[in-house]
């Protein structure tokens, strides 16, 4: 039985040209996290494997940085980065947990961030 829950940054916004940290946290389960995949729409952005470390997609190599933790940092944001992002936790023995974050990249200089995991 899957008892875990994923807490995410939820709906967040950031300025064009800036950076943002995407964070998810899996709680309420003792399952072992084997791998976390980060996806945007239908693209795989990055993989964090518990044993092997991080790999960033060649498509996003220059704009995505691993961490902090199991999170992901998106840099040099453009309006095209607006959309849904998913953290997919592969766990044993529970299976797969998925969290959703919606990022809006704003042209304006005022961008409000989500309440949790926000960048100072």
């Amino acid at each position: 039985m899957m008892t875990g829950t994923i807490e995410t940054t939820g709906n967040i916004s950031a300025e064009k040209g800036g950076s943002i940290i995407l964070q998810c946290h899996l709680s309420s389960t003792t399952a072992q996290v084997t791998q976390v995949n980060w996806e945007q729409q239908d693209q795989l952005l990055a993989i964090c494997n518990a044993d092997l470390g991080w790999h960033i997609s060649p498509s996003f190599k220059d704009r995505v940085a691993p961490g902090p933790g199991l999170g992901l940092t998106l840099q040099s944001l453009t309006v095209n980065d607006t959309g849904e992002y998913f953290c997919i936790y592969h766990t044993y023995p529970d299976g797969t947990y998925t969290g959703r974050i919606f990022l809006e990249v704003l042209e304006s200089s005022v961008a409000e961030h989500g309440a949790r995991f926000q960048i100072p």
Epitope: Q35, Q41, D42, Q43, L44, I47, N49, L52, G53, H55, S57, P58, S59, K61
Partner: antibody, heavy 119, light 107 residues
Amino acid sequence: EVKLVESGGGLVQPGGSLKLSCAASGFIFSDYHMYWVRQTPEKRLEWVAYISKGGISTYYPDTVKGRFTISRDNAKHTLYLQMSRLKSEDTAMYYCARQSSYDFAMDYWGRGTSVTVSS
Amino acid sequence: DIVMTQSHKFMSTSVGVRVSITCKASQDVGTSVAWYQQKPGQSPKLLIYWASARHTGVPDRFTGSGSGTDFTLTITNVQSEDLADYFCQQYSSYPLTFGAGTKLELK
């Protein structure tokens, strides 16, 4: 069992066009990113195209950009490669390959379909 | 483009021995390297990904190592069915590139 079966290869004249297909079975096709890779007569492997699982994103090397188009039909579990303005240097065995769910490597390859560009 | 150099086009070996096939990247690719085996008349098969992780069903006599620019595929206790072409590939950045291959043959 993962199975990828390419078809559509053949002999074509320089400047001509050809459309390759790759029929996938044994896995949930729409969950996987896919590639086309070719192998020249000298046995060199060259990446030709990438398509994301939903078909939204595509990438190509400069050698084929603007001439080749990768696409997919998830309902038909089929990957395609439309090749136009073909050159003699496009002569090769063309393979479709699946991207691993664990990484960005190519974990399963089809048997290939041969393309010869010659007058 | 990142060039993957396999310095030995051919390597001669004997059954039961240990052989190491090397691959050098023209720039740092971290551990974004795979190794493929191709037997005559067949398509390439994934052996190693993430520079050192063995693909499902691959015998443990195949071992991948290295990071940055220098990578090695080691086959311990070579079997006759291991005689094939071996290719390295980087997937750190586009365009994805392969080494020219190393043919493992009997002495």
